[in-house]
């Protein structure tokens, strides 16, 4: 490797440290090195080595303390089940290669919970969930034996305990001991055995973290009955007074490094964004630390619940702020959190016991000073009266999430700090900061929030429909007349909003094809609902060949759409979803939404067009201020409108106008774009304000969009604020919460 030519700033030679089949990189200014292997391989016998004061690298020792002469990259294997109760697994093997499958089967009288088939993944973990054969005889259900662990205890009565342990050399993550609790749930969280080379994939972390965080945020009433043996989901009442504090604790020590610190900041910005998207307004505390902690935002500050302001503070933090004192004192950092939680003069304020506390710690897990931080977690639990009363343990009031980043993470340390809750994961180990950034991109848009409107997956790996998941393609086949292409927008699980002119009264439902999410299959149509005031021939007598007022229609689907990352609704004006999306108070009125989305000025907006089979966003400006009049007057250049005396005859108050060259040269819509949404993008959310209706100039005559277009090339869109009574009536059963 090229490294053999360089000499680290530390005092260890790089002679002979190479790894067979891989490479290495220096960490901590040459005081440590990390072996790097190709995907599907891991460094044997160790992943990292430290430069000792004697000037030599730490020895290559196997798990059973044998010394190895040279490091090598070995194929990653998944562990075998050490035991499986009340059933069998096949095939048998000492270990399983990546992509090998294992199947579980239960004996008569036992039901399989979890995954019957699991596949060995490239990170050395099994896909799916722990397979458990249970006969429902216990007060609690069988907690199972996660692959690679061993369980002691097979009685599942109230207050019975089971303990887990790992084979030599593996670290237990999760709970070593779990107790069967009142209500039929197990204390703690499912354990797993981790090898040093094992990392959580971004997808695993995003799913697990988000589903746990959602449990905390999306609170519903806890008075939910559940019988013994049922899995009890954590249910939380969030009272509207903003009873949640989130403490973001960021390691800024030497071992983290500047680029990782910047990456971690990005992750937390995404997290704040995500939480805001749920429509809750927690108070934030923001702490960075090295040798000493620095509190940037206190939960007691007036603006601590203003997500935008907290994000601004976070963005202004510099890694250099801790440069002079760059140890890792996690204990002191958590003490800073404790100080924010505690109350002056030890007098608890009104409602202290209804506040949920979430600590999110990002670290490389290497505290090297100040003592064991777990003691502070214990103090916090005491302060919040958690785990003291068996009848009301209050575990829901504290969640500690720990993100360990990089090869030096001490798994035992981070596991000790993290919360342990049934069916949830609070401790994560990711390979590097790029992986953690991936997590937070994925998390910004994961399963629990699929019903949120106007959310997209802006990640670099996303497809067209990840980025425009509401976009629908519509085509109408007319025998002997060819076919008409239009666009539309998914607005609910049963409805697509589009333009009325895409259809004629003679079009039959079976001749209308709608596809969403980039899927090849067409959706079955139940009915097309036109706005009752739409009549394309309404002004023929007045010499206006085509009249597009109220040019909107709703397509009702026969079957409910299954939301996913590539199919989800856009936000509609004057709905509760849009109030939350814009982070406005719940008392916001329709008029206030209108002022926010369509102020009297040039409004930056976008539409989605298909070019060469790719969906692209086109940025335009809605002329809603001083340019509105001239924009509308250009309608006279439209074919058939040249004889219109008063342009308001064709450009009614129902229209929004885009196009032209001022303030910028706007791209124009094409025929196939009709019916698609005109969108305002605000606060990382997408709100539909219009439906594309008609244009003055056909800029796409020969299947190609013309580059040079006249200044009078304008486009007109139906303003959704003007057709709200109709939308509200037709979508009344869709749970959109119209204001």
């Amino acid at each position: 490797t090229p490294w053999s030519l360089a000499r680290p700033q530390g005092s260890c030679s790089l002679e002979g440290v190479e790894i067979k089949g891989g490479s290495f990189r220096l960490l901590q200014e040459g005081q440590a090195l990390e072996y790097v292997c190709p995907s599907g391989f891991y460094p044997y016998p160790v992943q990292t080595r430290t430069c000792r004061s004697t000037g030599s690298w730490s020895t290559l020792k196997t798990q059973d303390q044998k010394t190895v002469r040279k490091a090598e990259c070995r194929a990653i294997h998944c562990p075998r089940p050490h035991d499986f109760e009340n059933g069998e697994y096949w095939p048998r093997s000492p270990y399983y290669n990546v992509s090998d499958e294992i199947s579980f089967h239960c004996y008569d009288g036992y039901t399989l919970r979890g995954s019957a088939n699991r596949t060995c993944q490239v990170n050395g973990r099994w896909s799916g969930q722990t397979a458990i054969c249970d006969n429902g005889a216990g007060y609690c259900s069988n907690p199972g034996i996660p692959i690679g662990t061993r369980k002691v205890g097979s009685q599942y009565r109230l207050e019975d305990s089971v303990t887990y342990h790992c084979s030599r050399g593996l670290t237990l993550r999760g709970s070593q001991r779990r107790t069967c609790q009142e209500g039929g749930s197990w204390s703690g969280t499912e354990p797993s055995c981790q090898d040093s080379f094992m990392y959580d994939t971004p997808q695993e972390v995003a799913e697990a973290f988000l589903s746990s965080l959602t449990e905390t945020i999306e609170g519903v009433d806890a008075e939910d009955g559940h019988g013994p043996g049922e899995q009890q989901k954590r249910k939380i009442v969030l009272d509207p007074s903003g009873s949640m504090n989130i403490y973001l604790v960021l390691d800024g020590s030497d071992s983290i490094g500047a680029s990782n610190f910047t990456g971690a900041k990005k992750c937390l910005v995404n997290l704040i964004e995500k939480v805001a998207s749920y429509g809750v307004k927690p108070r934030y505390g923001l702490v960075t630390y090295a040798t000493y902690p620095k509190i940037w935002v206190k939960v007691s500050e007036a603006d601590s619940s203003n997500a935008d302001w907290v994000t601004k503070q976070l963005n202004e933090i510099n890694y250099e702020d801790h440069k002079l004192k760059s140890g890792t004192n996690t204990k002191k950092a958590l003490q800073a959190v404790y100080s924010m939680m505690s109350w002056p003069d030890d007098v608890p304020p009104e409602g202290w016991n209804r506040t949920r506390h979430v600590i999110i710690l990002m670290t490389d897990g290497l505290h090297n000073m100040g003592g064991d931080p777990i003691t502070v977690i214990d103090e916090i639990r005491d302060l919040l009266y958690i785990g003291k009363d068996r009848k009301n343990p209050r575990e829901d009031y504290l969640d500690v999430y720990v993100f360990g980043v990089g090869p030096l993470v001490n798994q035992v340390n981070i596991n000790a700090l993290a919360s342990k809750k049934d069916n949830e994961q609070h401790v994560f180990k990711v390979k590097d900061m790029e992986n953690l950034e991936d997590v937070f991109y994925q998390m910004i848009d994961e399963s629990q929030s699929l019903s949120l409107c106007g959310m997209v997956w802006e990640h670099r790996k996303g497809t067209d429909y990840h980025k425009q998941p509401w976009q629908a393609k519509i085509s109408v086949i007319r025998p002997s007349k060819g076919h008409e292409s239009c666009m539309g927008a998914v607005v609910s699980e049963y409805f697509v909003l589009t333009a009325a002119h895409c259809f004629t009264v003679d079009d039959k439902e079976h001749s209308i094809k709608v596809s969403v999410g980039g899927e090849k299959r067409d959706l079955e149509i139940e009915v097309v609902l036109f706005h009752p005031n739409y009549n394309i021939n309404g002004k023929k007598e007045a010499g206006i060949p085509e009249f597009y007022d109220y040019d909107v229609a709703l397509i009702k689907l026969k079957n409910k759409l299954k939301y996913g990352q590539t199919i989800r609704p856009i936000c509609l004006p004057c709905t509760e979803g849009t109030t939350r999306a814009l982070r406005l108070p719940p008392t916001t009125t329709c008029q206030q939404q209108k002022e926010e989305l369509l102020p009297a000025q040039d409004i930056k907006a976008l539409f989605v067009s298909e070019e060469e089979k790719k969906l692209t966003r086109k940025e335009v400006y809605i002329k809603n201020g001083d340019k509105k009049g001239s924009c509308e007057r250009d309608a006279q250049y439209a074919p058939g409108y040249d004889k219109v005396k008063d342009i308001s005859e064709v450009v009614t108050p129902r229209f929004l106008c885009t196009g032209g060259v001022s303030p910028y040269a706007d791209p124009n819509t094409c025929r196939g774009d009709s019916g698609g949404p005109l969108i305002v993008h605000k606060r990382s959310r997408f709100i539909q304000v219009g439906v594309i209706s008609w244009g003055v100039v056909d800029v796409c005559k020969n299947q190609k969009r013309q580059k040079q277009v006249p200044a009078h090339a304008r486009d007109f869109h139906i303003n959704l604020f003007q057709v709200l009574p109709w939308l509200k009536e037709k979508l009344q059963d869709e749970d959109l919460g119209f204001l």
């Epitope: 089940p81 050490h82 035991d83 499986f84 109760e85 009340n86 059933g87 069998e88 697994y89 096949w90 095939p91 048998r92 093997s93 000492p94 089967h105 239960c106 004996y107 008569d108 084979s167």
Partner: antibody, heavy 119, light 112 residues
Framework: EVQLLESGGGLVQPGGSLRLSCAAS????????MNWVRQAPGKGLEWVAV????????YYSDSVKGRFTISRDNSKNTLYLQMNSLRAEDTAVYYC????????????WGQGTLVTVSS | QSVLTQPPSASGTPGQRVTISCTGS?????????VHWYQQLPGTAPKLLIY???KRPSGVPDRFSGSNSGTSASLAISGLRSEDEADYYC????????????FGGGTKLTVL
């Protein structure tokens, strides 16, 4: 009552073949993996083969691999052992045994059938 | 030559505690595979006595217990009785040669 009953044993010449059967009753046969274990006269137990509950996975001891075939017919609740190219050292009482649990403990045994390989 | 090594014989007087050892290697007990113990009374088929190192099937008295550590396992019988006179076999999965079950050579327990 859970029961296993072996049959098909007897005297056979070296190089000859024999097919053992094991009839299961009192439990859902198709749910369990099954084994053949043998015991030479005056000697200890020697495992021969195992077959998974659905017959998809089979493992043999080295001493019989290529000569013996374990199979099952779940519709008939029967386990089989087809023994070819028999040798004198295959002389033993052959037991069929049910496996239980992830570590394949043999919790139910038949009474055994004697196979004698001799010229 | 058995893969798992057991003493050929053991003895004890009624009421005494006896232990039978079973030594394996890194491909069976040492690899973490659980050990099972079987009892074979004279002229009968074997019977499962202990499974998964230390679990007792129903009907087996708690005088019988199993344990294991490293590459070996042991069966302990306390309060020895005359009806305990039998052959005892340990068994475990072994991951060599594509996987197989291996037995110990057996220990003949005599109650004096």
């Amino acid at each position: 009552e859970v029961q296993l009953l072996e049959s098909g044993g007897g005297l056979v010449q070296p190089g000859g073949s024999l097919r053992l059967s094991c009839a299961a009753s009192g439990f859902t046969f198709s749910s369990y993996s099954m084994n053949w274990v043998r015991q030479a006269p005056g000697k200890g137990l020697e495992w021969v083969a195992v077959i998974s509950y659905d017959g998809r996975f089979i493992y043999y001891s080295d001493s019989v691999k290529g000569r013996f075939t374990i199979s099952r017919d779940n519709s008939k609740n029967t386990l089989y052992l087809q023994m070819n190219s028999l040798r004198a050292e295959d002389t033993a009482v052959y037991y069929c045994a049910r496996s239980y649990g992830g570590n394949l403990a043999m919790d139910v045994w038949g009474q055994g059938t004697l196979v004698t390989v001799s010229s | 030559q058995s893969v798992l090594t057991q003493p050929p014989s053991a003895s004890g007087t009624p009421g005494q505690r006896v232990t039978i050892s079973c030594t394996g290697s890194s491909s069976n007990i040492g690899a973490g595979y659980d050990v099972h113990w079987y009892q074979q009374l004279p002229g009968t088929a074997p019977k499962l006595l202990i499974y998964d190192n230390n679990k007792r099937p129903s009907g087996v008295p708690d005088r019988f217990s199993g344990s294991n550590s490293g590459t070996s396992a042991s069966l302990a019988i306390s309060g020895l009785r005359s009806e305990d006179e039998a052959d005892y076999y340990c068994a475990a999965w072994d991951d060599r040669l594509n996987g197989r079950v291996v037995f110990g050579g057996g220990t003949k327990l005599t109650v004096l």
